[in-house]
């Protein structure tokens, strides 16, 4: 039975040209995290595998950095980066947990962080 929950940074905003950290945290389970995938819509941005380490998609290498932790840092943001991002936690023995973050990249200098929320 899957008892864990994913806590994410929720709905966030950032300035064009700036950077943002996408962060998820798996709690309420003793399952072992074996791999975390970061996806934007249907595109795989990066994987952090417990055995093999990080692999960043070459298409995003110049603008995506691993970490901190299991999170992902997006740099040199453009308005095209606005959209949904997913952290997909592969665990043993539970299976897969998915968290969602919505990022809005703003032209203006006003960029507020949304409240944290949980996805079961």
């Amino acid at each position: 039975m899957m008892t864990g929950t994913i806590e994410t940074t929720g709905n966030i905003s950032a300035e064009k040209g700036g950077s943002i950290i996408l962060q998820c945290h798996l709690s309420s389970t003793t399952a072992q995290v074996t791999q975390v995938n970061w996806e934007q819509q249907d595109q795989l941005l990066a994987i952090c595998n417990a055995d093999l380490g990080w692999h960043i998609s070459p298409s995003f290498k110049d603008r995506v950095a691993p970490g901190p932790g299991l999170g992902l840092t997006l740099q040199s943001l453009t308005v095209n980066d606005t959209g949904e991002y997913f952290c997909i936690y592969h665990t043993y023995p539970d299976g897969t947990y998915t968290g969602r973050i919505f990022l809005e990249v703003l032209e203006s200098s006003v960029a507020e962080h949304g409240a944290r929320f949980q996805i079961p």
Partner: antibody
Framework: EVQLQESGPGLVKPSETLSLTCAVS?????????WHWIRQPPGKGLEWIGF???????VYNPSLKGRITISHDTSKNQFSLKLSSVTAADTAVYYC??????????WGQGTTVTVSS | DIQMTQSPSSLSASVGDRVTITCRTS??????LAWYQQKPGKVPKLLIY???TLAEGVPSRFSGSGSGTDFTLTISSLQPEDVATYYC?????????FGQGTKLEIK
Amino acid sequence: EVQLQESGPGLVKPSETLSLTCAVSGYSISSGYDWHWIRQPPGKGLEWIGFIRDSGSTVYNPSLKGRITISHDTSKNQFSLKLSSVTAADTAVYYCARGLFWYFDVWGQGTTVTVSS
Amino acid sequence: DIQMTQSPSSLSASVGDRVTITCRTSENIFSYLAWYQQKPGKVPKLLIYNTKTLAEGVPSRFSGSGSGTDFTLTISSLQPEDVATYYCQHHYGNPLTFGQGTKLEIK
């Protein structure tokens, strides 16, 4: 078009060190992907050896760890394998390959290495 | 280590036949399975990754399915140029491992 080409001595004596190089053309090895070595003993299946990242960090097959060193030379756009204390069991065709999320999308032609005195 | 077991180890089929090769893993690898084709005397070629995604230039008669521990490579209509040995490989942990291969021949 990305191309990989292995080179190195075809014959190595037992207990010596096998040294191979993979020259990459059509893509900069410092621009992403992982760069792997895989081998295939005569008439047998494939065995993954290890890889080097564009950053220079390495991951090795635990069954060979301690005998393997993978390094790269970004100025020459090539990466290399050293396998120490070889025995006849290390006789194989050695392939270099480009890795994307740990599967292999481009392979070199392979080079045959025989371990014999 | 994740063990990869392919079956059958060899098979013979006729041109136009539907051919199925299976790969079973010793533990859950989710969808992280690739298939390669190695023609006699040639270099392995990536056919499929992430269980079902066809690599660039691979004919649509090849398809992959499965998840967890059981996976299948299917050739919908066997062609003479499909004579080869086929290998599965998980791309999920260290060490990366391959199946022992399935040798496919034409009757």
